[in-house]
């Protein structure tokens, strides 16, 4: 069960704001995991799939220990904007094979948009600059084949899953330092 819909609670407590962002991130993580599992059931993946247009994972050894809140929020927002674009692209160009997952992809997109709004609100409350992506946006062309769109879906969901885990870990870790 996801959190109830509705506008964010007004608060001047950064811990409460972070809590709210963590909750949405955890909800989205659960949705993504479920959808990735559905994908694996319907279209078994042979090994790891990657997509050049996806952001590189915001994780490297030692990263979490040295995180600062502005960096986490900025990086997370930029990466999630990229994933949102990829989910929109999947829904638009995924072809008939992914049409069966359309309701789930639609729900995932809505949750992603909601989390992005919450992060934007949190950043404005903390007076952080709303950074634009530093890398140029790579246009997403149509998948080469039906199998290409399935591989892309595996890559997008897998990457989003790991990014959200990094986000929950990072945000909760930062909360302990506030």
């Amino acid at each position: 069960p996801g959190p109830p819909a509705g506008s964010p609670r007004v608060s001047s407590d950064p811990r409460a704001d972070l809590d709210s962002a963590v909750l949405l991130t955890r909800s989205l993580l659960a949705d993504t995991r479920q959808l990735a599992a559905q994908m694996r059931d319907k279209f078994p993946a042979d090994g790891d799939h990657s997509l050049d247009s996806l952001p590189t994972l915001a994780m490297s050894a030692g990263t979490l220990g040295s995180l600062q809140l502005p960096g986490v929020l900025t990086r997370l927002r930029v990466d999630l904007m990229s994933y949102l674009r990829h989910v929109q692209w999947l829904r638009r160009a995924g072809g008939p094979s992914l049409k069966t997952l359309e309701p789930e992809l639609g729900a995932l997109q809505a949750r992603l948009e909601r989390l992005l709004r919450r992060l934007q609100l949190l950043m404005s409350r903390l007076a952080l600059p709303q950074a634009a992506p530093d890398q140029p946006v790579i246009p997403l062309g149509p998948p080469a084949s039906a199998w290409g769109s399935i591989r892309a879906a595996h890559a997008i969901l897998g990457g989003l899953h790991l990014t959200l885990d990094w986000a929950v870990r990072g945000l909760l870790l930062l909360k302990t330092r506030l």
């Epitope: 959190p3 993580l29 995991r33 990263t63 899953h161 885990d165 990094w166 302990t176």
Partner: antibody
Framework: EVQLVQSGAEVKKPGASVKISCKAS????????MDWVKQAPGQRLEWIGD????????IYNQKFTGRATLTVDKSASTAYMELSSLRSEDTAVYYC????????????WGQGTTVTVSS | DIVLTQSPASLALSPGERATLSCRAS??????????IHWYQQKPGQAPRLLIY???NLASGVPARFSGSGSGTDFTLTISSLEEEDFATYYC?????????FGQGTKLEIK
């Protein structure tokens, strides 16, 4: 069958270090975090920290920061925990456990490694 | 850190009886429909085994006689009809914040 198999019991002197391994099998290693939990005699279970095998940095319980080091060898589906500057209070059973991403509940556990610190 | 207190410390019951174990958190571990409490069973010389996750979800392979309930700060693990193999120590654990912490355990003994 999903399994976590840990290295054998260790006896160490105070001030020494110990490195425990945890070999995962039966699932995709990078789909879950690997957590470590301490169980000292007569004490409650204590979470030490976790690591995302996909390449994320570890996170630690503040109590263990600076003494515990978590690493993984992705190619061997193996996680490691090293504990340094050992003291008698570190005498315990140490478990590795598979952690659900973002939720910190542990659905598969290793059999445990007993570490005894004694002079 | 959030402190979890389990009660009773020990409980002696007979097979077939109903067991009710309690776990109280020092602050709320629930938020918007999610309760970040999990329950484990541990037998002597063995590793803990996950029974219930997120307050009320039965872990894979766990018999339906186990159930979890509660929200906010008060949680309950119920075993509807005790079997011989259920006599063990039970721990609750939260994952609302970092670090996750465990209760001190409730030892369930045969009467």
């Amino acid at each position: 069958e999903v399994q976590l198999v840990q290295s054998g019991a260790e006896v160490k002197k105070p001030g020494a270090s110990v490195k425990i391994s945890c070999k995962a099998s039966g699932y995709t290693f990078t789909d879950y975090n690997m957590d470590w939990v301490k169980q000292a005699p007569g004490q409650r279970l204590e979470w030490i920290g976790d690591i995302n095998p996909h390449g994320g940095g570890p996170i630690y319980n503040q109590k263990f920061t600076g003494r515990a080091t978590l690493t993984v060898d992705k190619s061997a589906s193996t996680a490691y925990m090293e504990l340094s500057s050992l003291r008698s209070e570190d005498t315990a059973v140490y478990y590795c456990a598979r952690g659900e991403l973002g939720h910190w509940y542990f659905d598969v556990w290793g059999q445990g490694t007993t570490v005894t610190v004694s002079s | 850190d959030i402190v979890l207190t389990q009660s009773p410390a020990s409980l002696a019951l007979s097979p077939g009886e109903r067991a009710t174990l309690s776990c109280r958190a020092s602050k709320s571990v629930s938020t918007s429909g999610y309760s970040y409490i999990h329950w484990y069973q541990q037998k002597p010389g063995q590793a803990p085994r996950l029974l219930i996750y997120l307050a009320s979800n039965l872990a894979s392979g766990v018999p339906a006689r186990f159930s979890g309930s509660g929200s906010g700060t008060d949680f309950t693990l119920t075993i509807s009809s005790l079997e011989e193999e259920d006599f063990a120590t039970y721990y609750c654990q939260h994952s609302r914040d970092l670090p996750p912490t465990f209760g001190q355990g409730t030892k369930l003994e045969i009467k």
